[in-house]
C-alpha cells in the first residue's frame, strides 16, 4: 500500500512538474501592426485568445520574458503576403526577414538568436504573392531575459493567427 501511495505521489509530482513547465505561443495582433519598410520590432501579440496561450512565462511591452532558467526551444513563423486589392507594391524587389532577439536586463545586451528570410521579386503582374519563414532553435535562457521579434516590411505581414506567431517551451533544466 505504501509503495502504491509513493507511486501515485510520484505521478502527481511528475504531472505537476510538467504542468509547471513554462511555455508560450503568441499570435500577431492584427489591429496593431506597425508600418514601415525597414526593420521594426513587433510589440503587439496576443497571449490569451485563439491559439495563443502562455504559462509560467510573462508577456510584457511586446517581449516574452523568461521566468525560469532552462534550455528552451524557441520558434517563430512569419508570413508575408500581398494581394492587389490592397493596392500596388511601390517596389517589386523586397527583403523579407525575421529576427528573433534576446535581450538581457542584468547585463544590458542584445543578441540575434535566429534570423531567416530571403530577397524576393514580387512582380506587379501577379495578383497575389506569399512567402513564409520558419525559424527554430534550442537555447539556454536565464530568468529575466527577454525574447522579441523584428521583421522587415511589416505592412506585408499576414495578420492571421495561423500565419504569424512565435513561441517558446522549456525542454530541460540547466544542470
Amino acid at each position: 500500500e505504501k509503495a502504491m501511495v509513493d507511486g501515485s505521489w510520484l505521478d502527481l509530482a511528475k504531472r505537476s512538474k510538467l504542468e509547471a513547465q513554462p511555455f508560450a505561443h503568441l499570435t500577431i495582433n492584427a489591429t496593431d501592426i506597425p508600418s514601415g519598410s525597414h526593420k521594426v520590432s513587433l510589440s503587439s501579440w496576443y497571449h490569451d485568445r485563439g491559439w495563443a496561450k502562455i504559462s509560467n512565462m510573462t508577456f510584457s511591452n511586446g517581449k516574452l520574458i523568461v521566468n525560469q532558467d532552462g534550455f528552451y526551444y524557441l520558434y517563430a513563423n512569419i508570413c508575408f503576403r500581398h494581394h492587389e486589392t490592397s493596392g500596388d507594391l511601390a517596389t517589386e524587389y523586397l527583403q523579407l526577414m525575421v529576427y528573433v532577439t534576446k535581450t538581457s536586463i542584468k547585463i544590458p545586451s542584445s543578441h540575434t538568436l535566429m534570423k531567416g528570410g530571403s530577397t524576393k521579386y514580387w512582380s506587379g503582374n501577379s495578383e497575389f504573392h506569399f512567402y513564409s519563414i520558419n525559424v527554430g532553435g534550442f537555447f539556454k535562457l536565464r530568468s529575466g531575459e527577454e525574447i522579441s521579434i523584428e521583421v522587415s516590411n511589416p505592412s506585408l505581414l499576414d495578420p492571421d493567427q495561423d500565419a504569424t506567431y512565435f513561441g517558446a517551451f522549456k525542454v530541460r533544466d540547466i544542470d
Partner: antibody, heavy 126, light 103 residues
Framework: QVQLVQSGAEVRKPGASVKVSCKAS????????IHWVRQAPGQRLEWMGW????????KFSQKFQGRITVTRDTAASTAYMELRSLRSEDTAVYYC???????????????????WGQGTLVTVSS | EIVMTQSPSSLSASVGDRVTITCRAS??????LNWYQLKPGKAPRLLIY???SLQSGVPSRFSGSGSGAEFTLTISSLQPEDIATYYC?????FGQGTKVEIK
C-alpha cells in the same frame, strides 16, 4: 498646406505629344507617389499611371502602355506626364493626385488620392 | 479586371433630404473603396476612404458603409454646396459617377 499645381491648358494636333507638369508643395515630395487620372467629356474618371516620387518606379494602365511616360524632378518637387501619339479621344482634363500612403511608412501604394491638382485641359484637334 | 457600377446615374433631391448612392464591385474588394466629389473647374475631393473612414476636413453629414462588393455613400442632410458628381473608386477602377442636383 499640401498643394498640387498643374500647368496650363494645351491644344495639340493628332499625332503630337503633350507634357503636363504637377508641382507639389507643403509636404516631402519624395515620400509619396503621384498618380495621373483623366476625365474625357461625359466619361468617368480614368486612372493612367503612378510614379513613386522617391525611387522613380512607375506603373501604367495597359491602355496607355507604350504611349505614356511619367517622370519626376525631386529637386523641383514636380512630376511630369507625357502622352504621345495623341488622338481626338485623348481630349480630356488631366489630373495629378497624391497617393495617401507614405513610402517611408510602408510599401503599398494604396490608391487613396488625398490631394489633387486643379486639372489641365488637353484638347486634341486638327 | 474589377468593374465598378454606380446607381443611380443622377438624382434630384431637396435641401435637407437624405441622399444615398450605391456602388457595386464586380468581385469582392474587402473594404478598399473610396468616394470622391467632383465639381466643374475644381480639384476633386476625397470624401471617404476604406469604405467608411471620413477624410479630414469633410463634413460629418457624409458617411460611407459596406464591405465585400456593395457600398453606399450617404449624405444625411443635403446642402446646396453638395451639388456635384460623386465617384466611387477601387484602386485603378472608378464608377461611372452619380450627378446630384437640387430640386
Amino acid at each position: 498646406q499640401v498643394q498640387l499645381v498643374q500647368s496650363g491648358a494645351e491644344v495639340r494636333k493628332p499625332g503630337a505629344s503633350v507634357k503636363v507638369s504637377c508641382k507639389a508643395s507643403g509636404y516631402d515630395f519624395s515620400n509619396y507617389a503621384i498618380h495621373w487620372v483623366r476625365q474625357a467629356p461625359g466619361q468617368r474618371l480614368e486612372w493612367m499611371g503612378w510614379i513613386n516620387a522617391g525611387n522613380g518606379n512607375t506603373k501604367f494602365s495597359q491602355k496607355f502602355q507604350g504611349r505614356i511616360t511619367v517622370t519626376r524632378d525631386t529637386a523641383a518637387s514636380t512630376a511630369y506626364m507625357e502622352l504621345r501619339s495623341l488622338r481626338s479621344e485623348d481630349t480630356a482634363v488631366y489630373y495629378c493626385a497624391r497617393d495617401s500612403s507614405q513610402m517611408v511608412r510602408g510599401i503599398i501604394i494604396a490608391y487613396y488620392f488625398d490631394y489633387w491638382g486643379q486639372g489641365t485641359l488637353v484638347t486634341v484637334s486638327s | 479586371e474589377i468593374v465598378m457600377t454606380q446607381s443611380p446615374s443622377s438624382l434630384s433631391a431637396s435641401v435637407g433630404d437624405r441622399v444615398t448612392i450605391t456602388c457595386r464591385a464586380s468581385q469582392s474588394i474587402s473594404r478598399y473603396l473610396n468616394w470622391y466629389q467632383l465639381k466643374p473647374g475644381k480639384a476633386p475631393r476625397l470624401l471617404i476612404y476604406g469604405a467608411s473612414s471620413l477624410q479630414s476636413g469633410v463634413p460629418s453629414r457624409f458617411s460611407g458603409s459596406g464591405s465585400g462588393a456593395e457600398f453606399t455613400l450617404t449624405i444625411s442632410s443635403l446642402q446646396p454646396e453638395d451639388i456635384a458628381t460623386y465617384y466611387c473608386q477601387h484602386t485603378r477602377a472608378f464608377g461611372q459617377g452619380t450627378k446630384v442636383e437640387i430640386k
